[in-house]
């Protein structure tokens, strides 16, 4: 089908895109969409005395019921939507006034959609459309044994054997712009080694320091070993699951696929199927003897509430195939569009570097917040979120957490993807404004129940005191529970508060707990905080209180299922602007609970930022005099010295967003 053309009547303005639709283009490439218009009623030449009304050209893209204006041009001037600066242009306009051809650079998956070329001249209006499909997916691939074991040849082999090819820098850049994040150095087609980072951190800085972007090690010797970034282009066939009540061994899975007129799918094929929406909460054998499952709809019991192609490992350090005699579903591929390359065409046999990948694709709406972690390009301890339990990896092992996979025996582990969604950075400079040091800040010392930030820790979380409104002691028991829930936490139990106290947590504010008691933890007793313990340290209790009495509350946040990031700009934000800014970055203003959880994982910012409840707080891991005192914790900025009062919503501050 060729373009749609519309115009009101025959002898009028007509617009055409002489290009078959849909147009399929590769990720990372550029695209030219020809668009020409003819306006018989308004010839270009007019008498000098009349000022001709210039045609107005408008290009827009419609995707998922959302229309974005890319650019508007009239009278020789082109106004480009600032979000698409350097991305879209009219190469032939105004040199050829009737040529509205659009050029789109470095295509991302997000650039898919229906492109509309609309021309308005006076009261006349005509348009043509073209559907553009950006095809392909970049994924990170790693040898099963350990990290960084592929030389350049083997890296390519790993991709080829998985229905993919080695990715180009342009493809990795486009994937990065789509939100791909991976703290693992991998080969690319130009013999460079790179990795995409949205939220720089220790071990992932590379050559860009604290700026987001694709890091590069430059061109490397082909004998050096790294991981690889592969690119799966498209497939005409179909990936499907074969199952039986007793599941299959690897050999049985291969036989079952053959019996069904198919073969075991490759990782690349499963990736493409996942990209097209495949969602299975059950692990299955693939051709390279790996066991994986695709999750498109995040839910807690399917790989830790994460999106992506998940991988099952035998060992806790995320290595090792499941035993070929263990039983899983079979993931089959039917289609004639891929021809397996024989092993001997790479000069090697055996399985010494059959590989597995670790990746999640962001940029999708999730019903629940996402669990976001990252390994390091050059190693350091990783703090992770919401696994069933964790290990502390040695620096030589892949630094990724793991969770139990669905429907798998207790010896197999599924990866938690090594990914962080796109984050808004503070653009590399601190911004002026209300400095935490000048504000009244609470002296809450909030201690992680099980460990200090920066250390591997057992299951646990953070207990924190919460006062949602401008005044102290304003919550009934019911309101207290709701307040914790609203902030992304739950009301703490007496045991959790006790554990926090034993880890050094102190707070001279009475707060509700889950059992309807009211308590507060005191490490260093002082006159107004003696409570029922005289001068001994301990958790003070008022006992079970009537639910209509009002106090503060102690909340408990388990682990962060997503990412908190610091957002700023020169003029900073009012509360409303902060809300809108986060939303424009596919995020929400972080809740207090989310900020505490991020703090417990090492977030340290000496700038106060808006949170969802209208409060202004900042997380301090490394205390320093200018940052709210000499103790770590999440500091709160109050209006009054008695630590009450919320800031004016029209005052301007930074923000903490959550995605």
């Amino acid at each position: 089908a060729v373009t749609v053309e519309t115009s009101d009547h025959d002898n009028s303005l007509s617009v055409s895109i002489p290009q078959p639709s849909p147009l399929r283009v590769l990720l990372g490439t550029s695209l030219t969409i020809p668009c020409y218009f003819i306006d018989p009623m308004h010839p270009v030449t007019t008498a000098p005395s009349t000022a001709p009304l210039a045609p107005r050209i408008k290009w827009s893209r419609v995707s998922k019921e959302k229309e974005v204006v890319l650019l508007v041009a009239t009278e020789g001037r082109v106004r480009v939507n600032s979000a698409y600066q350097d991305k879209v242009s009219l190469p032939n306009y105004p040199a050829i006034p009737s040529d509205a051809t659009l050029e789109v650079q470095s295509l991302r998956s997000n650039d898919s959609g229906v492109y509309r070329c609309e021309v308005m001249h006076g009261i006349e209006d005509s348009e043509a459309t073209l559907e553009v499909v950006v095809k392909g997916i970049v994924f990170h691939y790693r040898a099963i044994s350990t990290r960084y074991t592929l030389d350049f040849d083997r890296a390519q082999r790993a991709c080829l054997q998985n229905s993919a090819i080695i990715a180009t820098p342009e493809q990795l850049q486009a994937a990065y712009e789509d939100g791909f994040h991976q703290c693992d150095a991998g080969w690319l087609a130009d013999q460079t080694v790179r990795y995409p980072i949205h939220t720089p951190r220790e071990g992932c800085y590379g050559d860009k320091d604290e700026f987001p972007g694709v890091r590069t090690y430059g061109i490397r010797d082909t004998n050096e070993t790294y991981d690889v970034y592969c690119f799966a282009e498209e497939m005409e066939g179909e990936v499907f699951y074969a199952t039986s009540p007793e599941k299959f061994t690897f050999q049985e899975a291969a036989n079952e696929c053959r019996r069904l007129g198919a073969r075991l799918a490759t990782t690349g094929q499963l990736y493409l199927a996942w990209q097209a929406g495949m969602d299975m909460c059950s692990a299955g054998w693939l051709a390279d003897r790996s066991v994986r499952y695709p999750i498109s709809k995040a839910r807690p019991n399917c790989g830790g509430n994460l999106l992506g192609v998940r991988t099952v490992y035998v060992h806790a350090n995320q290595t090792g195939y499941p035993d070929p005699s263990s039983r899983y579903d079979a993931i089959c591929y039917t289609g004639e569009d891929f021809v397996d390359i024989p092993e001997n065409f790479f000069g090697v046999g055996g399985e010494e570097d059959i590989t597995v990948q670790t990746v999640t694709w962001p940029d999708m709406e999730l019903p629940l917040p996402r669990n976001i972690t990252e390994g390091e390009a050059r190693g350091s301890v990783i703090l992770t979120v919401k696994p069933i339990f964790e290990v502390s990896p040695s620096p030589l092992e892949p630094e990724e957490p793991f969770t139990f996979a669905p429907e798998i025996g207790a010896t197999a582990f599924a990866e938690v993807e090594n990914e962080t969604g796109e984050a808004t950075r503070p653009w590399g400079f601190p911004t002026p404004g209300l400095g935490p040091a000048t504000a009244f800040t609470s002296e809450d010392l909030v201690v992680q129940v099980t460990a200090v930030p920066g250390q591997p820790h057992l299951p646990g979380g953070v207990v924190f005191h919460y006062r949602p409104g401008p005044t102290r002691y304003s919550l009934t028991f019911e309101e207290a529970q709701q307040a914790c829930l609203r902030t992304g936490a739950v009301i703490a139990s007496p045991e959790q508060l006790q554990a926090a106290y034993e880890a050094g947590y102190e707070q001279c504010d009475a707060g509700w707990l889950r059992d309807q008691t009211v308590r507060y933890p005191i490490v260093s007793p002082r006159t107004p905080c003696v409570g029922d313990k005289d001068s001994s340290p301990g958790v003070r209790t008022y006992g079970v209180r009537p639910s209509t009495e009002t106090y503060d509350v102690y909340c408990f946040v388990d682990r962060l299922e997503g990412e908190v990031f610091f957002a700023t700009r020169l003029e900073q934000f009012t509360f409303q602007e902060a809300l809108e800014f986060c939303e424009s970055h596919n995020a929400t203003l972080a809740t207090t609970g989310q900020l505490y959880a991020a703090w417990s994982r090492g977030l340290d910012k000496c700038y106060a930022g808006w949170l969802a409840d209208g409060s202004l707080r900042y997380p301090i891991v490394t205390p320093r005099p200018a940052c709210g005192g000499d103790k770590p914790g999440v500091r709160t900025v109050y209006l009054y010295p008695n630590q009450t009062g919320l800031p004016d919503p029209l005052s301007r501050h930074h923000a903490f967003c959550f995605r």
Partner: nanobody
Framework: EVQLVESGGGLVQPGGSLRLSCSAS????????MFWVRQAPGKDYEWVAS????????YYDDSVKGRFTISRDSAKNTLYLEMNNLKPEDTALYFC????????WGQGTQVTVSS
Amino acid sequence: EVQLVESGGGLVQPGGSLRLSCSASGFTFSGSWMFWVRQAPGKDYEWVASINSSGGRTYYDDSVKGRFTISRDSAKNTLYLEMNNLKPEDTALYFCARSPRVGSWGQGTQVTVSS
């Protein structure tokens, strides 16, 4: 846009020689493994030869070992297949490939070995 264009096929007598060429564009040729694949009438695809990105490693199907030579000229973005001592069973459509996805191959060049 990725393009692979094969040439050099033709009719040749048994024992004769041919040199196939494949001109590549639209991708990083110098960074890609390349392959020759063939399909005889009514038969499955058969991998003939492969060469790594630097040209330093080459691999062949047993049926062509010693008779065929794969090579590349990265400066010209061209892949070659030198075919000597051709046999009737070498008759096939020969494709230049950079991946196992058939849709990304060239159109092929026909080689017919017949007396």
